[in-house]
């Protein structure tokens, strides 16, 4: 991956509406060093999208990804 592990990505905006669940292949949490907590969903096209971890749909997607 070109996005090396020595960087600490942070999010400053959240996606406003849910992505299609089928488009998402994985996720990660941003660092606690960031000013805003965030979940980053990675799509099947390798795009990275910031989402609000407090949103119900985000928690549901995480649970779904953990079970798949």
């Amino acid at each position: 991956s070109p996005y090396s592990s020595d960087t600490t990505p942070c999010c400053f905006a959240y996606i406003a509406r849910p992505l299609p669940r089928a488009h998402i292949k994985e996720y990660f949490y941003t660092s606690g060093k960031c000013s805003n907590p965030a979940v980053v969903f990675v799509t099947r096209k390798n795009r990275q999208v910031c989402a609000n971890p407090e949103k119900k749909w985000v928690r549901e997607y995480i649970n779904s990804l953990e079970m798949s």
């Epitope: 070109p2 996005y3 960087t7 990505p9 942070c10 999010c11 400053f12 905006a13 959240y14 996606i15 406003a16 941003t30 965030a38 980053v40 390798n46 795009r47 990275q48 999208v49 910031c50 989402a51």
Partner: nanobody, 124 residues
Framework: EVQLVESGGGLVQAGGSLRLSCAAS????????IGWFRQAPGKEREGVSC????????YSADSVKGRFTISSDNAKNTVYLQMNNLNPEDTAAYYC?????????????????WGQGTQVTVSS
């Protein structure tokens, strides 16, 4: 060492223009989109514009559409933000940032690298 270096800020009268530059080094330019954020005192950071280094696709916030134009010179690893018809509400520190890999979801994309910023002040 990764570097994003902004330049071109300054003081301008309302209705005037500025061109900001963001020179990138230390990473593969084609793997990232380069975006501009701005932050005015006491306000949230706002995603202004973005350009994909790989295919040239762009994003502009509604607040700057028709006034700000983003462009890229991949040979120089540099992104430009041409700002026309500036108004006092555009006064802010402007930062360039690297986000993978394109502008589809900008500004709701994780930022991997930041510049130090350049100040733009628009007087009325």
């Amino acid at each position: 060492e990764v570097q994003l270096v902004e330049s071109g800020g300054g003081l301008v009268q309302a209705g005037g223009s500025l061109r900001l530059s963001c020179a990138a080094s230390g990473f593969n330019f084609d793997d990232y989109a380069i975006g501009w954020f701005r932050q005015a005192p006491g306000k949230e950071r706002e995603g202004v514009s973005c350009i994909s280094s790989s295919d040239g696709s762009t994003y502009s916030a509604d607040s700057v559409k028709g006034r700000f134009t983003i462009s890229s010179d991949n040979a120089k690893n540099t992104v430009y933000l041409q700002m026309n018809n500036l108004n006092p509400e555009d006064t802010a520190a402007y930062y360039c940032a690297a986000a993978p890999p394109d502008c589809t979801y900008y500004p709701a994309t994780p930022i991997y690298y930041w510049g130090q910023g350049t100040q733009v002040t628009v007087s009325s």
